[in-house]
Amino acid sequence: LDLSNVQSKCGSKDNIKHVPGGGSVQIVYK
């Protein structure tokens, strides 16, 4: 299971991966 693009809704922003666009996002970051 590839979780490399998962963006936490409530955790630290430090692990946000820079992806090339919205098509790569799995969860909308709040």
Epitope: H18, G22, G23, V28
Partner: antibody
């Protein structure tokens, strides 16, 4: 309130390089992407590339790859766009914009623009 | 590359009348996981920097008048102005951010 303030107008010779700066205030600089967009006289908007200051990671428009370099200095909340091997067709207004990364991926704040004129 | 095509390129309007701009993408802008279309609309007024009007195809940016409405999904999108006002003149651009960023050619809205 986020504000993006760009450096002043430049006149450059063909073959030279230009470096435009974009200083951000308000908000947390490293939490969003800075995109660079240009507009030639009387033409539309053209996306050049972007940087995620937190990591320094960049993406570029294939059209400009090899000629454009986007960097960021987190300590001064400033992004830079350097374009090399300038030609007359690069005469344009260059904008930086905050790209609301991770949510809308939309550019919600824009700099005032920097006119770069390439002329011999 | 994702290509964005706007129509019409020029739109003469009468104040108080509705106006509509179409934007088509060469591939779908819908992310099935987030259920969002990564399509935004911008207005560039004469002599100004562009300003964000709509994101996620239909979400109005804060402070944007409710006469502006974005709709559509996948590859076909529309920006509607319910009643055009004089201050709405300028060039409207759609932009995809599904993969990298691409702007449409722009639609110039001017008063008849």
């Amino acid at each position: 309130q986020v504000q993006l303030v760009q450096s002043g107008a430049e006149v450059k010779k063909p073959g030279s390089s230009v470096k435009v700066s974009c200083k951000a205030s308000g908000g947390i600089f490293s939490d969003y992407v800075i995109s660079w967009v240009r507009q030639a006289p009387g033409q539309g908007l053209e996306w050049m590339g972007e940087i995620f200051p937190r990591s320094g990671s960049t993406y570029y428009n294939e059209k400009f790859k090899g000629r454009v370099t986007i960097t960021a200095d987190k300590s001064t909340s400033t992004a830079y766009m350097e374009l090399s091997s300038l030609r007359s067709e690069d005469t344009a207004v260059y904008y930086c914009a905050r790209d609301y990364y991770g949510t809308s991926f939309a550019m919600d704040y824009w700099g005032q623009g920097t006119l770069v004129t390439v002329s011999s | 590359d994702i290509v964005m095509t706007q129509s019409p390129l020029s739109l003469p309007v009468t104040p108080g009348e509705p106006a509509s701009i179409s934007c088509k993408s060469s591939q779908s802008l819908l992310n099935s996981r987030t259920r969002k279309n990564y399509l935004a609309w911008y207005l560039q007024k004469p002599g100004q920097s562009p300003q964000l009007l709509i994101y996620w195809a239909s979400t109005r940016e804060s402070g944007v008048p409710d006469r502006f409405t974005g709709s559509g999904s996948g590859t076909d999108f529309t920006l509607k102005i319910s009643r055009v006002e004089a201050e709405d003149v300028g060039v409207y651009y759609c932009k995809q951010s599904f993969y990298l960023r691409t702007f449409g050619q722009g639609t110039k809205v001017e008063i008849k």
